[in-house]
């Protein structure tokens, strides 16, 4: 009886169930009832990463330096490359086809989470107790300044975008 | 101990018909693809064809040379494989060896061959 | 149909001498190549499958070798039982073909 299934990493064709070609690797032709299925490993700038049945490799992925991209993890003939951006720059998107500054974080919020190569700032808002004033991709949010410890007082309250504001005690007797 | 036998060779006139068989022993005979080979006096091999296991329903594959003149079957109750050869011509005058084909997709071959046959094809 | 040519047709070897036989296909056929040795009056025997694989019980001085349409079948160290007839055969494509043979014969 001809196989209507066939096992884990082979495929059904003219009645046969012939072998998948392995990761890297791209198929050449089909098994016979004598032959084994044939193929051939994918040239330098090509890659295939599962068992499979493709005549052609996949071309790795270009790292377009006009786009803010660098290469993270160079391809193999099982895996492709990893693209990064530059410094300053991040994905647009999980395939990280091309890059955008990374955004700063206004007065009145702090940096969260530093931006990565494939990751976005990430900002706060500045708690009571914490300011900021400044447009910044790495500042965080700064507490207030404690008049106390200077023997001063505050003289003008702080804000998220302020620092409070000490002066002299007054001297009254 | 694994073997082949052929029986059934002779002298036979041009036109004529003639049943080679072969008793096949220690060996499980329906598992296996059996096959013809010939060989004229002096000469190198000839595949002349064969006939598939029991997993692939017994079918038959032909040397273009023969095809339409010789018919392989087989009786799995006796373990013996038969050719049957019709409308012989004087080229089909050989040795003809009857081989298992054993083997897997990495490799297949003639890995048992019994003594053979003469068949004479002359007037 | 694949032709299979070998070469030489005949050659004279002393016992000890290292023989080197080729066997060159009409096509590619990617390894599915076995070696036969023939006595005279003798059936053929299986001496090497799939290019390079010995068949149980073949001495290890017989290796074979190749790829693609070009394959050898080498015996490091004649012995006086190797003087025989050496047959090819392709097993990649129907119908099966062999080729003409190699005498090896005593020097």
């Known amino acids: 009886e001809p196989p209507t299934a066939c096992r884990e990493k082979q495929y059904l064709i003219n009645s046969q169930c012939c072998s998948l070609c392995q990761p890297g690797q791209k198929l050449v032709s089909d098994c016979t009832e004598f032959t084994e299925t044939e193929c051939l490993p994918c040239s330098e700038s090509e890659f295939l990463d599962t068992w499979n049945r493709e005549t052609r490799c996949h071309q790795h992925k270009y790292c377009d330096p006009n786009l803010g991209l660098q290469v993270q993890q160079k391809g193999t003939s099982e895996t492709d490359t990893i693209c990064t951006c530059e410094e300053g720059l991040h994905c647009t998107s999980e395939s990280c086809e091309s890059c955008v500054p990374h955004r700063s974080c206004l007065p009145g919020f702090g940096v969260k989470q530093i931006a990565t190569g494939v990751s976005d700032t990430i900002c706060e808002p500045c708690p009571v107790g914490f300011f900021s004033n400044v447009s910044s991709a790495f500042e965080k949010c700064r507490p207030w300044t404690s008049c106390e410890t200077k023997d001063l007082v505050v003289q003008q309250a702080g804000t998220n975008k302020t620092d409070v504001v000490c002066g002299p005690q007054d001297r009254q007797r | 101990e694994v073997q082949l036998v052929e029986s059934g060779g002779g002298l036979v006139q041009p036109g004529g018909s003639l049943r080679l068989s072969c008793a096949a022993s220690g060996f499980t005979f329906s598992d296996y693809y059996m096959s013809w080979v010939r060989q004229a006096p002096g000469k190198g091999l000839e595949w002349v064809g064969f006939?598939?296991?029991?997993?692939?329903?017994?079918?038959?594959e032909y040397a273009a040379s023969v095809k339409g003149r010789f018919t392989i079957s087989r009786d799995n109750s006796k373990n013996t494989l038969y050719l049957q050869m019709n409308s012989l011509r004087a080229e089909d005058t050989a040795v003809y060896y009857c081989?298992?084909?054993?083997?897997?997709?990495?490799?297949?071959?003639?890995?048992?061959w019994g003594q053979g046959t003469l068949v004479t094809v002359s007037s | 149909d694949i032709q299979m040519t070998q070469s030489p047709s005949s050659l004279s070897a002393s016992v000890g001498d290292r023989v080197t036989i080729t066997c060159r296909a009409s096509q590619d056929i990617r390894n599915y190549l076995n070696w036969y040795q023939q006595k005279p009056g003798k059936a053929p025997k299986l001496l090497i499958y799939y290019t390079s694989r010995r068949d149980s019980g073949v001495p290890s001085r017989f290796s074979g070798s190749g790829s693609g349409t070009d394959y050898t079948l080498t015996i490091s160290s004649l012995q006086p039982e190797d003087f025989a007839t050496y047959f090819c055969?392709?097993?990649?494509?129907?119908?099966?073909?062999f080729g003409g043979g190699t005498k090896v014969e005593i020097k």
């Open positions: 006939i598939r296991n029991k997993a692939n329903a017994y079918t038959t």
């Open positions: 055969q392709q097993g990649k494509t129907l119908p099966w073909t």
């Open positions: 081989a298992r084909y054993g083997g897997l997709r990495q490799g297949w071959y003639f890995d048992v």
